[in-house]
């Protein structure tokens, strides 16, 4: 099985124990590590952070002691903007310049492949996204002709049904991608006005969502029905939780909220907590399991957080094995307890290790 793990370059800027550099990663934990994110400047793939080249080097030296480890560079992301991707993909010259710029950039900096993180193609971009993937793959095949190992091509796709329908020709893009990471999280957010888990495995009776699509099981099944081969589908598992501020004394699933939860001490983003911050939060909190959805949530005062723990990730791994998927994807290594100092187990990357162990179990 693949264990595809994202590392985010901006995690270096978190203060104190939240700061994570690639040299803190475990070289034997994941089969693939994806560095997020690269930029596109003037139709050319490029660095984003001032010290990206140094961090690329740190990441790729992990392969010195584990030659089986593959590293990819992810281009795009939330801050990149869909419009910028759209302009590049829809113009033949821009798209082809971008594609041509990729192999030498990846080779120079020691990466084994490219991950496309266009979040998200619009309805008019669907065909262009397919063309981008098809032409990129053709370039990778051609570039590898002089006896080089072919560069890998993957994409991170939304798990939301509406986005899947408007953005992706699943059957076509699946032909050209080496694997597809389905982002089976962020199903539920503060915009709903109620509490709810952002990454439930199943819908469950407790689900207050207005639809039956906002869960991992539906998204995976839908992708498979649309023609994604199970052998290429990698299922996303978050090492972060989504939090809410409760608006009343109700604390269950579907309780009214006044907005996102208070920012974490290190991640400093309202409504989001890293797993290592959740471990802190759990001291003195009340933990509940949403039985049908097979995921936990915790409450403390007026704060509510839905997250994944070692038990829920094992359930998710068992599920992906039952569906004969290619493996699991983790967003993100730097949100797990990467130092092993927060979650009281004396174990670095406890969630990712639980996923790895479950994947290896017979």
């Amino acid at each position: 099985y693949k264990l595809v793990c994202y590392y985010t370059s901006w995690s270096q800027y978190r203060e104190g124990d939240g700061s994570c550099f690639p040299d803190a990663l475990d070289r034997f934990l994941c089969t693939h590590i994806i560095y997020s994110f690269a930029n596109i400047s003037n139709d050319h793939i490029d660095t984003w952070e001032w010290n990206d080249v140094t961090l690329y080097g740190m990441l790729n030296t992990l392969k010195n002691r584990n030659p089986n480890l593959k590293t990819l560079l992810s281009v795009g992301g939330w801050n990149f903007g869909s419009q910028r991707f759209s302009k590049i993909a829809s113009n033949t010259q821009s798209r082809r310049t971008f594609i041509k710029s990729v192999p030498p950039f990846l080779r120079t900096h020691g990466f084994d492949g490219l991950d496309l993180a266009w979040l998200y193609p619009g309805r008019r971009d669907k065909q262009h996204f397919t063309t981008l993937i098809k032409e990129m793959k053709a370039e990778f095949i051609k570039e590898a002709q002089p006896g080089k190992k072919q560069l890998l091509l993957s994409a991170a796709l939304s798990a939301g049904k509406v986005t899947i329908d408007s953005s992706y020709d699943i059957a076509k893009i699946s032909q050209h991608l080496d694997f597809i990471s389905i982002m089976t999280y962020d199903f539920h957010g503060a915009w709903r006005g109620t509490t709810g888990h952002h990454s439930p495995l199943f819908r469950g009776q407790e689900d207050a969502s207005p639809d039956r699509f906002s869960n991992t099981d539906y998204a995976v099944g839908y992708m498979l029905r649309l023609g994604a081969p199970a052998s290429k589908l990698v299922m996303g598992i978050p090492t972060f939780g989504r939090s809410f501020t409760l608006a009343s004394s109700e604390t269950g699933v579907g309780a009214p909220i006044s907005g996102p939860g208070i920012p974490g001490r290190f991640t400093k983003e309202a409504g989001t907590l890293a797993y290592y911050e959740i471990c802190d939060f759990l001291r003195g909190a009340t933990v509940h399991r949403i039985l049908g959805q097979q995921v936990p949530y915790a409450t403390k005062g007026n704060q509510w957080v839905g997250y994944d723990d070692q038990e829920s990730v094992k359930s998710k791994v068992q599920y992906l094995k039952d569906r004969q998927l290619a493996g699991a994807m983790v967003w993100a290594l730097d949100l797990d307890d990467f130092q092993g100092s927060f979650c009281g187990q004396d174990l670095r990357f406890p969630l990712t290790n639980a996923i790895k162990d479950a994947l290896a179990a017979t």
Partner: antibody
Framework: QQLKESGGGLVKPGGTLTLTCKAS????????VCWVRQAPGKGLEWIGC????????TYYASWAKGRFTTSKTSSTTVTLQMTSLTAADTATYFC??????????WGPGTLVTVSS | DVVMTQTPASVSEPVGGTVTIKCQAS??????LAWYQQKPGQPPKLLIY???TLASGVSSRFKGSRSGTEYTLTISDLECADAATYYC????FGSGAVDSPFGGGTKVVVE
């Protein structure tokens, strides 16, 4: 792995000349081949490039468009056709092979003199 | 269009010294900057690409760095063989190609 330019020489103003860039030990599959010139005692001036597998085609400096045309004539040969030449075009012309806009391999250059 | 301004036009340093050449891009070109060395009667030779990556076979005495839109080539432990003219180049290509990608050049004299 070598590149060699040929076809330079003396040409009258208003005349036409075709330079050839020949590769030995390599072919031009999936490479960008570019032309750069250097007037006597001056700096480097980019003319234009061709993507030899025609994925991104040809592209030129704005001043060279229409008067300079680069083509791939075989797997190891690229040409640069220059028309309406003036004394200002007197220079050593280099061809260079690039992966991503930077040129790792250069020919020794060929001198073009435009004079009556 | 991007304009590359290279300074100084010439510099003289003794053997063993250090030379710093700067190249200012008129707008952001990210890491798409290359440095070349050219000796009289010879074609240019690639030294650095992607702003800081050393080309194959080039001495580690040559170092490229970037700060915003300013790029620097540093030559340390200067040798007589380093006497040459150095050029920076915006290495955008295809749809991103710029009209005048080369800087004006810096002549390095080794005393």
């Amino acid at each position: 792995q070598q590149l060699k330019e040929s076809g330079g020489g003396l040409v009258k103003p208003g005349g036409t000349l075709t330079l050839t860039c020949k590769a030995s030990g390599i072919d031009f599959s999936s490479n960008v081949v570019c032309w750069v010139r250097q007037a006597p005692g001056k700096g480097l001036e980019w003319i234009g490039c061709i993507d030899t597998d025609d994925f991104i085609g040809t592209y030129y400096a704005s001043w060279a468009k229409g008067r300079f045309t680069t083509s791939k004539t075989s797997s190891t040969t690229v040409t640069l056709q220059m028309t309406s030449l003036t004394a200002a075009d007197t220079a050593t012309y280099f061809c260079a092979r690039g992966d991503a806009g930077y040129y790792a391999l250069w020919g020794p250059g060929t001198l073009v003199t435009v004079s009556s | 269009d991007v304009v590359m301004t290279q300074t100084p036009a010439s510099v003289s340093e003794p053997v063993g010294g250090t030379v710093t050449i700067k190249c200012q891009a008129s707008q952001s070109i990210g890491s798409y900057l290359a440095w070349y060395q050219q000796k009289p009667g010879q074609p240019p030779k690639l030294l650095i690409y992607y702003a800081s990556t050393l080309a194959s076979g080039v001495s580690s005495r040559f170092k490229g760095s970037r700060s915003g839109t300013e790029y620097t080539l540093t030559i340390s432990d200067l040798e007589c063989a380093d006497a040459a003219t150095y050029y920076c180049q915006c290495s955008y290509f295809g749809s991103g190609a710029v009209d005048s990608p080369f800087g004006g050049g810096t002549k390095v004299v080794v005393e």
